[in-house]
């Protein structure tokens, strides 16, 4: 049975961070791991994709991960099917969104005295909790003319007077985490003597060494004072300015200008407008450094004619939200149309061979612009150059087979020979071109070929026979040096083919005729009762018409085959005594003796002073000990034949006698005693 | 002993429809995938369908829409509704546990 | 659509010979290795011999053997037995729980 040793369980994600879900079996055979999202089967994109059998995610979607995820695992063999717990994301997430005007309907129907009701756009989940601000400054619950109702995310002020103008912002945070409003609201109760904004600031993004404006401006009866305030609140004046803002201007209008900015530049900066009456009001910007950073190489793609493929841009990290756009051949691609822009994604439909090449992803923000290439080859379906012909190739030549072929991406050519592979060895080579070459051209060659020449767009094949031109051979050639034995009957086979069936002949090399006792048959050498006259030089002619004809010559010895007069026998010696191993064969040529001893040839020119090779071929060692225990083989060689014959020698202690034992007691086994 | 049985083949006119029954027995069917492949007279294998072990089903593309595969647990049996019948679709028509265990087939045949 | 070809569609050979045949699919089967390789004789139901691409089902000689991976695959027989005439299917398993067949090659004497 499929058994689940990791189960996917439900878990908190974060909005746009990696997540994991984990699924491993263990099953009798091997199995296949596939997930479903609410029953559906998932496809792996470059976000969400099978990493061995758990489920990967790049970046956690909202929308695309809510619902169940459930790992299954199949036994594809049995067609037994296992399914895990059903798994699903808490995924946690917050937007920005506007602070807007919820009653009265409309800003021209706010009046002093009347109840204004502002809701904060921010949305999240968890629900995230919400404090709002004038001008920059919490508002706190709870305070004696304004509630806050965190359920409905508004603010209540009733009733609104002119105590109550300014800008209205708000934050909401939660377990993910926070976001600010992405536009304020202003509200406008006159009171001529309170501070009013007129122009609030706003966040800046700037790049390294370039300016950063910050505007602000209030208004009031008589005119209000404006001051600006670093993060650690030190005040940034014309005649004033902290030791890190030295390239800092406060304009007679109110806007702050920063020139060349560095890192530490970064960060918040307050401005402050005070009227005769009323309460400051403080608002806030942030001013932060561009940055982006580099993006993932492509792997080169190779599509096929007439399919829909997307390839994805993953875009840079970087500040401001680098945007993405995809070019090709230097010209941006349109959003429409049948090559395009979708999102990040470039689209092409209906694949088209002239869509092949480098497309570019640009990158681009205040800190600078990134690019990457990406080449897209389309496969197209191999056309011929050279088809393979039907050929007449020469035994033991090389012959080649053409297999010309043109595609994009260069296409694989494949050989088949009786329908069956031919994988590249010493005697079949295809080169790059396609051309198949057979090294040594062989008569069972001669048969059907077929070449496939093929791109993932598809293949195309032909066929050719090749017909052997076989050469006039000796098949085999006769060996040229043969032994005949003495008064036996012999033969020596003599067979050769050629295009056309070869006649075969013998001669004596001096010309001299064969004599009665020998016949040629069919080109077999026949001796009925072979005599020492018969040895001597042969000629084996072979001829046919078209080819002429070849011979082989063959020196014939007669001999008599050897055999052993004295064979060795098997030996026992004691240490340090003398082993004498015996041999002596007779044959014609008279045999020449070699000893083996523990599979070595022992060499009579280096056998040290221990051992000796006699003349008659016998085999004495002295001084025997215990490492030359072994088997020793004697042979027997001549030009004819060889023979061989072994024994074993055991080399042992000497016993210490008993007093049981009488000085005459044989040894338990034969013995050499010297 | 684990075995598949198909029956419910026949002859029926174009146009028509056939409901084709598999049962199974040595085992329960909501442990295992069940496909139904056809092979056509003299021609080759053509997959049709799966219905999986939850019961949820997938088709082969040309087979969408006019063929319908189901089962009933309690009886053990898989069924494949064949609708709008033509002469193509004269087939014998198996059905198999997984890869290796195959029922012996049934022939259906649409001819008027 | 998925596309699988098989090839040759027929194939003579000799007691003895090495086979191999070949399976190209329109696109990647699963897990890369999601393949089976079948044997069906004349009014008979098809056999498993190959399954994930290189497995030998159990009961199935040694001589039967399985390669490839992605879109590409291969079944060879080392050394053909009188036994082993017969068609052969190559089956394809992909994403969304969808299968598809080779359209068979047929094994004869030559």
């Known amino acids: 049975a499929i058994v689940f040793i990791k189960q996917p369980s439900s878990q908190d994600a974060l909005q746009g961070r990696r997540a994991l879900l984990r699924c491993e079996v263990e099953a009798p055979g091997p199995v296949h791991v596939y997930w479903l999202l609410d029953g559906a089967p998932v496809q792996d994109t470059e976000r969400r994709f099978a990493q061995g059998s758990s489920l990967s995610f790049a970046a956690v979607d909202r929308l695309q991960d809510s619902g169940t995820f459930q790992c299954v695992a199949r036994d594809d063999v049995t067609g037994e099917e296992a399914r895990s717990a059903n798994a699903s994301f808490n995924i946690k997430w917050i937007e920005a969104g506007p602070v807007v005007l919820k009653h009265p309907a409309s800003e021209a129907e706010i009046q002093p005295q009347t109840q204004v009701t502002l809701r904060c756009h921010i949305d999240g989940h968890p629900r995230p909790t919400y404090q709002w601000f004038r001008d920059g400054t919490p508002l706190s619950d709870g305070q004696s003319n304004h509630t806050v109702s965190s359920k409905e995310r508004n603010l209540t002020l009733r009733p609104a007077g002119p105590e109550h103008s300014g800008l209205y912002s708000c934050c909401a945070h939660s377990a993910f985490g926070q976001a600010c409003s992405s536009q304020n609201f202003t509200l406008s109760i006159a009171d001529e003597s309170f501070a009013r904004v007129v122009l609030a600031p706003q966040d800046v993004v700037v790049a390294r060494y370039e300016e950063a404006m910050f505007h602000c401006q209030f208004s009031a009866q008589p005119p209000p004072s404006l001051q600006w305030l670093f993060e650690d609140e030190t005040p940034i004046t014309n005649r004033s300015r902290p030791p890190h803002l030295r390239r800092a201007t406060v304009f007679a209008n109110g806007s702050l200008l920063l020139t060349q900015v560095r890192p530490r530049n970064a960060g918040i900066y307050r401005c402050i407008g005070q009227g005769q009456r009323g309460p400051p009001i403080i608002l806030e910007a942030t001013l932060h450094l561009a940055e982006i950073e580099d993006m993932p190489l492509f792997e080169p793609r190779v599509f096929t004619a007439g399919s829909e493929e997307r390839v994805t841009c993953l875009p840079p990290k970087g500040l401001p939200e680098p945007s993405v756009w995809w070019e090709h051949a230097g010209v941006r691609l349109p959003t429409h149309g049948r090559v395009y822009q979708k999102g990040h994604e470039l689209v092409l439909a209906n694949i088209a061979e002239s869509d092949a090449g480098v497309y570019t992803c640009h990158a681009a923000n205040l800190a600078g612009q990134r690019r990457q290439d990406v080449n897209i080859t389309v496969a197209t379906v191999p056309s011929w150059l050279k088809k393979p012909q039907d050929s007449q190739l020469e035994e033991g030549k090389p012959g080649y087979l053409d297999c010309l072929t043109q595609a994009t991406p260069k296409p694989t050519v494949v050989w088949y020979r009786n329908q069956m592979l031919i994988s590249e060895d010493s005697r079949f080579e295809v080169f790059k071109n396609g051309t198949l070459r057979i090294n040594s051209v062989e008569v069972y060659d001669g048969t059907w070929y077929r070449c496939m020449s093929s791109t993932p767009a598809g293949s195309i094949e032909a066929q050719a026979r090749v017909q052997v031109l076989e050469k006039l051979k000796f098949t085999p050639p006769p060996q040229p040096q043969q032994c005949m034995e003495f008064d036996k009957e012999a033969t020596v086979p003599c067979s050769a083919t050629g295009r056309e069936k070869p006649t075969i002949k013998w001669e004596r090399a001096d010309g001299s005729s064969l004599p009665e006792w020998v016949t040629d048959n069919a080109g077999t050498l026949h001796f009925a009762r072979v005599t020492r006259d018969d040895a001597g030089n042969y000629t084996c002619i072979a001829s046919n018409g078209p080819q002429g004809q070849i011979r082989a010559h063959v020196q014939l010895t007669v001999a008599v085959f050897i055999t052993f007069k004295v064979e060795p026998e098997r030996t026992t010696v004691y240490q340090g005594h003398t082993a004498l191993l015996q041999c002596e064969a007779q044959g014609d040529p008279k045999p020449l003796i070699q000893w083996k001893g523990k599979d070595r040839i022992l060499d009579p020119t280096k056998l040290g002073p221990r051992m000796h090779i006699f003349q008659n071929g016998s085999l004495v060692i002295h001084d025997v000990a215990p490492e030359d225990s072994g088997r020793y083989t004697c042979i027997a060689g001549n030009s004819c034949n060889i023979k061989h014959t072994e024994a074993p020698l055991y080399v042992v202690d000497k016993p210490v006698p008993e007093e049981s034992e009488g000085p005459g007691s044989p040894p338990p086994y034969k013995m050499i005693q010297t | 002993e684990v075995q598949l049985v198909e029956s419910g083949g026949g002859l029926v006119q174009p146009g028509g429809s056939l409901r084709l029954s598999c049962t199974a027995s040595?085992?329960?069917?909501?442990?295992?995938?069940m496909n139904w492949v056809r092979q056509a007279p003299g021609k080759g294998l053509e997959w049709v369908g799966i219905?999986?072990?939850?019961?949820?089903?997938y088709y082969a593309s040309w087979a969408k829409g006019r063929f319908t595969i189901s089962r009933d647990t309690s009886k053990n049996t898989v069924y494949l509704q064949m609708n709008s019948l033509r002469a193509e679709d004269t087939a014998v028509y198996f059905c198999?546990?997984?890869?290796?265990?195959w029922g012996q087939g049934t022939l259906v045949t649409v001819s008027s | 659509e998925i596309v699988m070809t098989q090839s040759p569609s027929t194939l003579s050979a000799s007691v003895g010979d090495r086979v191999i045949i070949t399976c190209q699919s329109s696109?990647?089967?699963?897990?890369?290795?999601?393949l089976a390789w079948y044997q069906q004789k004349p009014g008979k139901a098809p056999k498993l011999l190959i399954y994930?691409?290189?497995n030998l089902h159990s009961g199935v000689p040694s001589r039967f053997s399985g390669s490839g991976s992605g879109a590409e695959f291969t079944l060879t027989i080392s050394s053909l037995q009188p036994d082993d005439f017969a068609t052969y299917y190559c089956?394809?398993?992909?994403?969304?729980?969808?299968?598809?067949f080779g359209q068979g090659t047929k094994l004869t004497v030559l």
């Open positions: 198999a546990r997984g890869l290796y265990l």
């Open positions: 040595g085992f329960s069917l909501s442990n295992y995938v």
């Open positions: 219905i999986d072990s939850s019961g949820s089903t």
């Open positions: 696109q990647s089967v699963y897990n890369n290795n999601l």
């Open positions: 994930y691409t290189s």
């Open positions: 089956q394809g398993g992909y994403n969304g729980n969808i299968y598809a």
